[in-house]
Amino acid sequence: CKAMHVAQPAVVLASSRGIASFVCEYASPGKATEVRVTVLRQADSQVTEVCAATYMMGNELTFLDDSICTGTSSGNQVNLTIQGLRAMDTGLYICKVELMYPPPYYLGIGNGTQIYVIDPEPCPDSDF
């Protein structure tokens, strides 16, 4: 499989509302015009697919309606946002990029971004 370098940040801290954003950048060896981006989560040696989207250059990056991911693309960068995260979702989130068209097909897998999610402390009841 023709390999391609994919870069992503090592660590990201999710916001108090459970939102984490990071950039996934790929070094396109050719003239990529259709790209598929998949976010994988690795935890306890198990890998699961979080979300995926295929987009044409110049077109919007659209995930399925019920996806927890949103994103935008600019050149060889994809800005990914994952929402609705809780402490139990802490883990390594890997960016996988496939250059689908034109041929030849290229595949690149990042080293992963460790996303830390801290559930907010519940507000204490106030007694007056």
Epitope: C1, T33, E34, M56, M57, G58, N59, M100, P104
Partner: antibody, heavy 120, light 112 residues
Framework: QVQLVQSGAEVVKPGASVKISCKAS????????INWVKQNPGQGLEWIGD????????NSNQKFEGKATLTVDKSISTAYMELRRLRSDDTAVYYC?????????????WGQGTLVTVSS | DIVMTQSPLSLPVTPGEPASISCRSS???????????LYWYLQKPGQSPQLLIY???NLASGVPDRFSSSGSGTDFTLKISRVEAEDVGVYYC?????????FGGGTKLEIK
């Protein structure tokens, strides 16, 4: 239903240029690449190139570089191919075709073809 | 460029009988991602080409199941289990593994 309707037959003189159109309907124009294919009289098929309707980005067969220029007008869902410096061996039927990602970028819908005849 | 070679050039078939068309590529079309980038198109007389098969063995929407395709990385076969009159035309194999996309020279299927 999906349709690609091409402009009519052209008779042109050697050395001249011609611009063929391909009007798409029945789907979102910017969601699919458009390819162009040449068919010489009684012969097989030759891929000329493709265009991304979103940004006008093209990929082309080196054999046709300097011969064919591909463009789009998103506002009217139309793709164009201009052929320059025409010679007798450019006489052929030219097809536009839509690529479909679900079919791993096969050409799933084709225009009816435009016959270009180069004759003095 | 990848060269696609088809045989035979012409194939006369009796209706109801099976037919087989061969296609050979100058380079393996089986990618390490598991996909074989081989396609079959049919051009009926006086018409534009139409897609029959994608990814070597998958039938496009609306294609009758009497059509099937199989092969290795470089040798492919399109089979029609029982030829019907509407199957006449020129069959082309094509590759989409790398640019430029290339087609075979075509096989003309005709009714005896």
């Amino acid at each position: 239903q999906v349709q690609l309707v091409q402009s009519g037959a052209e008779v042109v003189k050697p050395g001249a240029s011609v611009k063929i159109s391909c009007k798409a309907s029945g789907y979102k124009f910017t969601d699919h690449f458009i390819n162009w294919v040449k068919q010489n009289p009684g012969q097989g098929l030759e891929w000329i190139g493709d265009i991304n309707p979103n940004n006008g980005g093209t990929n082309s067969n080196q054999k046709f570089e300097g011969k064919a220029t591909l463009t789009v007008d998103k506002s009217i869902s139309t793709a164009y191919m201009e052929l320059r410096r025409l010679r007798s061996d450019d006489t052929a039927v030219y097809y536009c075709a839509r690529l479909r990602r679900e079919y791993f970028y096969a050409m799933d819908y084709w225009g009816q073809g435009t016959l270009v005849t180069v004759s003095s | 460029d990848i060269v696609m070679t088809q045989s035979p050039l012409s194939l006369p078939v009796t209706p109801g009988e099976p037919a087989s068309i061969s296609c050979r590529s100058s380079k393996s079309l089986l990618h390490s991602n598991g996909i074989t980038y081989l396609y079959w198109y049919l051009q009926k007389p006086g018409q534009s080409p139409q897609l029959l098969i994608y990814q070597m063995s998958n039938l496009a929407s609306g294609v009758p199941d009497r059509f099937s395709s199989s092969g290795s990385g470089t040798d492919f076969t399109l089979k029609i289990s029982r030829v019907e009159a509407e199957d006449v035309g020129v069959y082309y194999c094509a590759q989409n593994l790398e640019l430029p996309l290339t087609f075979g020279g075509g096989t003309k299927l005709e009714i005896k």
